[in-house]
C-alpha cells in the first residue's frame, strides 16, 4: 500500500521520489500526477520532466531537490485540504515495462489554532525535540538526534533555518518526522 505523508494547511508538503541516473545528466522522463498511477501514464499531470529539464508544471508544484541527480521529490506550496489524496510519481525508464511507479498518500490536516502564551511553549509544541529522517521505504527511519536545550535568543535563528530548509516542509505533529528520501 502507499506510504502516507502529512502536512498542515498553509504549509508546504513534500512528497519524496528518487531514482539513480545511469550517468550524471543522463536523465529519465518523470511525471507527477494527482491520483493513483494508471497503467501507462501519470494521472492528472501536475509536473513533468524530460531528458533535460522540467518541461511542464502547474502553479504551487515544483521540484526543490536536484532533479539532475535523480531527486524528483515534489513540493506543493501552501497546501489546502483539497490537496489531500493520492499522488503518482512515475519514473519513465526506457525499455520494456521498466517504469517505476509510486503512489504516495498526502494527508492535509487543518492548521492548529493555539493561544499565544509564551514563545518558548509554542516553539516546543511545534518542533518536538526528536527529529527523524525517513528513507525510501517506510521501515527506513533513522534518528538524527535530539535538539539541544534552546534558549529564547536561539529560537528565531533555528526557526529561520528550519523554515528555509526543505526539511521543514514535512514536520509532523507527532515526532516531527522529516521525510528526505
Amino acid at each position: 500500500s502507499e506510504v502516507e505523508y502529512r502536512a498542515e494547511v498553509g504549509q508546504n508538503a513534500y512528497l519524496p521520489c528518487f531514482y539513480t541516473p545511469a550517468a550524471p545528466g543522463n536523465l529519465v522522463p518523470v511525471c507527477w500526477g494527482k491520483g493513483a498511477c494508471p497503467v501507462f501514464e501519470c494521472g492528472n499531470v501536475v509536473l513533468r520532466t524530460d531528458e533535460r529539464d522540467v518541461n511542464y508544471w502547474t502553479s504551487r508544484y515544483w521540484l526543490n531537490g536536484d532533479f539532475r541527480k535523480g531527486d524528483v521529490s515534489l513540493t506543493i506550496e501552501n497546501v489546502t485540504l483539497a490537496d489531500s489524496g493520492i499522488y503518482c510519481c512515475r519514473i519513465q525508464i526506457p525499455g520494456i515495462m521498466n517504469d517505476e511507479k509510486f503512489n504516495l498518500k498526502l494527508v492535509i490536516k487543518p492548521a492548529k489554532v493555539t493561544p499565544a502564551p509564551t514563545l518558548q511553549r509554542d516553539f516546543t509544541a511545534a518542533f518536538p525535540r526528536m527529529l527523524t529522517t525517513r528513507g525510501h521505504g517506510p521501515a527506513e527511519t533513522q534518528t538524527l538526534g535530539s535538539l539541544p536545550d534552546i534558549n529564547l535568543t536561539q529560537i528565531s535563528t533555528l526557526a529561520n533555518e528550519l523554515r528555509d530548509s526543505r526539511l521543514a516542509n514535512d514536520l509532523r505533529d507527532s515526532g516531527a518526522t522529516i521525510r528526505i528520501g
Epitope: P29, G35, F40
Partner: antibody, heavy 119, light 111 residues
Framework: EVQLVESGGGLVQPGGSLRLSCAAS????????MSWVRQAPGKGLEWVAA???????YFPDSVKGRFTISRDNAKNSCYLQMNSLRAEDTAVYYC?????????????WGQGTLVTVSS | DIVLTQSPATLSVSPGERATLSCRAS??????????MQWYQQKPGQAPRLLIY???NVESGIPARFSGSGSGTDFTLTISSLQSEDFAVYYC?????????FGGGTKVEIK
C-alpha cells in the same frame, strides 16, 4: 480534429518483417501514450503494443521479442516494427491514442491497415 | 492475464427495446476506488469507438441511451432503447494491468 492514419500494411511471407506507421494530427502528440491494437479476420480485438509519453514500452507475451514500438514526437508519428511474422499475425492493425493522463484505454482510433502473412 | 468473458455472444433485440450486455473479469479491476473497465462499439468495416470509460462514465458525444455499471469483476452495458445505428459488436476492455485485454465481444443484431 484528431486524426490517426496508419500505413505500411501489406502481404509478407512467414518469417518476414514489416514496419507500420501511424501519422497523428490534431493534438499534442508528445503528451499521449500510443498503442497498436489488431483484429484478425472475423475475430475480436487484441492489444499488441503501447508506448508511453515518456517512451516506456509495453507488449503482451504473444509478440514480445518479435514486435517493437517507437515514436518520433518531432514527426507526430508512432511505429510498429514487426519481425518474425507468423500466419497468426494476419490482422487489421489499428493505431489508437491512449486517453490523456491514463493511456490504458483508447479514445481515438485510425482506420486500420491490413497485414497478411502468407506464403 | 485478466480474462474478460462477455455474454451473450449474440443478442437479438427489436428496435426500441432495451439491451443488456455483460462482461465478467477473471479478477477485480478495482483500483483506488475506480473500476478500470471500458466499453467500445464496432460496426463492420469500421474502427472501434469508445462508449464508456471507468465502468460508468459516458464518453463525450455518445448518446445518453448508453450507460455502464458494475464494479469489481461484473460489469454491464445497457442500451435503453435500441436505435437502428446501435446494431453492432460491443467489446469490454480492462486497463487495470498489462497486458490490456478485451472481451470476446457481443454482437447485437436485429430481432
Amino acid at each position: 480534429e484528431v486524426q490517426l492514419v496508419e500505413s505500411g500494411g501489406g502481404l509478407v511471407q512467414p518469417g518476414g518483417s514489416l514496419r507500420l506507421s501511424c501519422a497523428a494530427s490534431g493534438f499534442t502528440f508528445s503528451r499521449y501514450a500510443m498503442s497498436w491494437v489488431r483484429q484478425a479476420p472475423g475475430k475480436g480485438l487484441e492489444w499488441v503494443a503501447a508506448i508511453s509519453s515518456g517512451g516506456s514500452l509495453y507488449f503482451p507475451d504473444s509478440v514480445k521479442g518479435r514486435f517493437t514500438i517507437s515514436r518520433d514526437n518531432a514527426k507526430n508519428s508512432c511505429y510498429l516494427q514487426m519481425n518474425s511474422l507468423r500466419a497468426e499475425d494476419t490482422a487489421v492493425y489499428y493505431c489508437a491514442r491512449g486517453r490523456e493522463a491514463d493511456g490504458g484505454y483508447f479514445d481515438y482510433w485510425g482506420q486500420g491497415t491490413l497485414v497478411t502473412v502468407s506464403s | 492475464d485478466i480474462v474478460l468473458t462477455q455474454s451473450p455472444a449474440t443478442l437479438s433485440v427489436s428496435p426500441g427495446e432495451r439491451a443488456t450486455l455483460s462482461c465478467r473479469a477473471s479478477e477485480s479491476v478495482e483500483y483506488y476506488g475506480t473500476s478500470l473497465m471500458q466499453w467500445y462499439q464496432q460496426k463492420p468495416g469500421q474502427a472501434p469507438r469508445l462508449l464508456i470509460y471507468a465502468a460508468s462514465n459516458v464518453e463525450s458525444g455518445i448518446p445518453a441511451r448508453f450507460s455502464g455499471s458494475g464494479s469489481g469483476t461484473d460489469f454491464t452495458l445497457t442500451i435503453s432503447s435500441l436505435q437502428s445505428e446501435d446494431f453492432a459488436v460491443y467489446y469490454c476492455q480492462q486497463s487495470m494491468k498489462v497486458p490490456l485485454t478485451f472481451g470476446g465481444g457481443t454482437k447485437v443484431e436485429i430481432k
